[in-house]
Interface confidence: low
């Protein structure tokens, strides 16, 4: 519908609280270095303007697009050039180029200090003193560190964050109540951010068709009783929502997401029997619940796929008439029958089917040519199955920390040019696949594992894109979205890599390691392991294990010593010498 004033339309649809929160998220995701107070000021100005438009849609500037209004507001920031450098050049452009320019300057790894959690009493005091500012600060800090965070979902996180403080700041043991809740929100938030980052990368790097294919497969697994036309409608609407959010159109995105949740709940009889509980919840919880809902049961007596997609004489005719619709139907039919497959595997099968039809429908005898197409699927299915089986066995044998270390060594040898912090972060996340997925029965392992790995490898791809250092990473990241994981799996040791010069400073540790949390201490040790492999890429597992065991013993010994700093200095030198000898450095 055409509205005289887009800003008034969205303000009325979303309400003042959500409007202000979403504008704050949008601004913080664009100008990631700006102080909180500056953003609050900008948001208040936009909100006051929106209210004038609600009162009179014909008022001056109320007919301007949201991009124009928000872009003009962002471009009033006085320190734009000093803080953001060339991003300031965006302000010389007209819409829509200006918004595209802002989008291109979003930084997946902004140079921001780590968020340090204050004492519980300090947080509770701040929460009680000014609840509104406290919650705005949460939105701001998350949004600027995660510039692609799914904005309507961040509103849901903020609601849970508020609920945690409301409950726990009154509890007898505030810390025991609050800290586990904050840990859970942090971990879920990181996972949510990474999942959304993959959706945006899919849309921005591979286009709408790639995203729609992903959505057809996933929604068909989730709603196997829904008709193809119903799934197609949901896919179109979901694509619009994510295109908007990934494009910085957060007000439209949140509004359309609410409409989609409403539609799904009004039509749940023709979509899924699992939606009842979700649809009884308030809006933010409802949308979150629908997005996470379990797969519905498969309809009984689904006919064989071969009849329509291999045996029929009309395959090429149907394909030629509407290629994407026919391939969409194939993907829908295959996915609803296979909740046990990962989405990326289903997309590989659809791609193989498409390639076969492209070739065979131009052949002298098309039917004979594509008759055995389903046989080509077997190796594609077996590859991830075998890989998951092997890695779950390794995980069960080693436990999470040592499994992460095995992956650290594996990936450092594959792509040693990648920065150490990125290798540590990505390998630690890859290693979490074990605890996350290996506990599941066979039928749930592959969708859990391979689709999770797609999310983690996308983190590697977006971090690497900022500072490309490895042609191998660029190749695996850009050639095919669905083949990223097989591409990385297939990489062998990089024989062209020139080992890093040995630097004793890299392996010098101090007493501060003793006061770190277990997680932080692991990261220190894993950082050292990556550096070791970069120095000695040909080191065997046994050599690396021996050095790491010595290192763990050294840290434990010095942390128990009376004079810790002296111990680290003296024993550290011995450890470095012993390690050099053991690895032949």
């Amino acid at each position: 519908d055409a509205h005289k004033s887009e800003v008034a339309h969205r303000f009325k649809d979303l309400g003042e609280e959500n409007f202000k929160a979403l504008v704050l998220i949008a601004f913080a995701q664009y100008l990631q270095q700006c102080p909180f107070e500056d953003h609050v000021k900008l948001v208040n100005e936009v909100t006051e303007f929106a209210k004038t438009c609600v009162a009179d849609e014909s008022a001056e500037n109320c007919d301007k697009s949201l991009h124009t209004l928000f872009g003009d507001k962002l471009c009033t920031v006085a320190t734009l050039r000093e803080t953001y450098g060339e991003m300031a050049d965006c302000c010389a452009k007209q819409e829509p180029e200006r918004n595209e320019c802002f989008l291109q300057h979003k930084d997946d790894n902004p140079n921001l200090p780590r968020l340090v959690r204050p004492e519980v009493d300090v947080m509770c005091t701040a929460f009680h003193d000014n609840e509104e500012t406290f919650l705005k600060k949460y939105l701001y800090e998350i949004a600027r560190r995660h510039p692609y965070f799914y904005a309507p979902e961040l509103l849901f996180f903020a609601k849970r964050y508020k609920a945690a403080f409301t409950e726990c700041c009154q509890a007898a043991d505030k810390a025991a109540c609050l800290l586990p809740k904050l840990d859970e929100l942090r971990d879920e938030g990181k996972a949510s951010s990474a999942k959304q980052r993959l959706k945006c990368a899919s849309l921005q790097k591979f286009g709408e068709r790639a995203f729609k294919a992903w959505a057809v497969a996933r929604l068909s697994q989730r709603f196997p009783k829904a008709e193809f036309a119903e799934v197609s409608k949901l896919v179109t609407d979901l694509t619009k929502v994510h295109t908007e959010c990934c494009h910085g159109d957060l007000l439209e995105c949140a509004d359309d997401r609410a409409d989609l949740a409403k539609y799904i709940c009004e039509n749940q009889d023709s979509i899924s029997s699992k939606l009842k509980e979700c649809c009884e919840k308030p809006l933010l919880e409802k949308s979150h619940c629908i997005a996470e809902v379990e797969n519905d049961e498969m309809p009984a007596d689904l006919p064989s796929l071969a009849a329509d997609f291999v045996e029929s004489k009309d395959v090429c005719k149907n394909y030629a008439e509407a290629k994407d619709v026919f391939l969409g139907m194939f993907l829908y039919e295959y996915a609803r029958r296979h909740p046990d497959y990962s989405v990326v595997l289903l997309l590989r099968l659809a791609k193989t089917y498409e390639t076969t039809l492209e070739k065979c429908c131009a052949a002298a005898d098309p039917h004979e040519c594509y008759a055995k197409v389903f046989d080509e699927f077997k190796p594609l299915v077996e590859e991830p199955q075998n890989l998951i089986k092997q890695n779950c066995e390794l995980f069960e044998q080693l436990g999470e920390y040592k499994f992460q270390n095995a992956l650290l060594v594996r990936y450092t040898k594959k792509v040693p040019q990648v920065s150490t912090p990125t290798l540590v972060e990505v390998s630690r996340n890859l290693g979490k696949v074990g605890s996350k997925c290996c506990k599941h029965p066979e039928a749930k392992r592959m969708p859990c594992a391979e689709d999770y790995l797609s999310v983690v490898l996308n983190q590697l791809c977006v971090l690497h894109e900022k500072t490309p250092v490895s042609d191998r990473v660029t190749k695996c990241c850009t050639e095919s979205l669905v083949n990223r994981r097989p591409c990385f799996s297939a990489l062998e040791v990089d024989e062209t890599y020139v080992p890093k010069e040995f630097n004793a400073e890299t392996f010098t540790f101090h007493a501060d390691i003793c006061t770190l949390s277990e997680k932080e201490r692991q990261i220190k040790k894993q950082t050292a392991l990556v550096e070791l492999v970069k120095h000695k890429p040909k080191a065997t597992k046994e050599q690396l294990k021996a050095v790491m065991d010595d290192f763990a013993a050294f840290v434990e010994k010095c942390c128990k010593a009376d004079d810790k700093e002296t111990c680290f200095a003296e024993e550290g030198k011995k450890l470095v010498a012993a390690s050099q000898a053991a690895l032949g450095l």
Epitope: E100, K205, F206, G207, E208, R209, K351, S480
Partner: nanobody, 115 residues
Framework: QVQLVESGGGLVQPGGSLRLSCAAS????????MSWVRQAPGKGPEWVSA????????RYAESVKGRFTISRDNAKKTLYLQMNSLKPEDTAVYYC????????GSQGTQVTVSS
């Protein structure tokens, strides 16, 4: 209906140049990254080069780096590939695709490099 129509191919001597064009219609061209892909006789498709939606970020296969230049004109909804210092091994059907896909949705244009 998405349509991609390539042109500009032909027969050229080794060391020569060609400029390929790809006219797009049926989708919001300026919103999508685009790629050039080629397929030599009897071989699978090979990704050649890619450009992001705004034209700022370009990527090339190792085999064409320094010789080929990808560009786009969003106003004209057209993708280009300037090919210099052509070699016999560049002989192939060249086609453009949306995103980084190597799936062929168009006829392509034949490039033959031969003396």
């Amino acid at each position: 209906q998405v349509q991609l129509v390539e042109s500009g191919g032909g027969l050229v001597q080794p060391g020569g140049s060609l400029r390929l064009s790809c006219a797009a219609s049926g989708f919001t061209f300026g919103r999508f990254g685009m790629s050039w892909v080629r397929q030599a006789p009897g071989k699978g498709p090979e990704w050649v080069s890619a450009i992001d939606s705004g034209g700022a970020d370009t990527r090339y296969a190792e085999s064409v780096k320094g010789r080929f230049t990808i560009s786009r004109d969003n106003a004209k909804k057209t993708l280009y590939l300037q090919m210099n210092s052509l070699k016999p091994e560049d002989t192939a059907v060249y086609y453009c695709t949306i995103g980084r896909s190597t799936s062929r949705g168009s006829q392509g244009t034949q490039v033959t490099v031969s003396s």
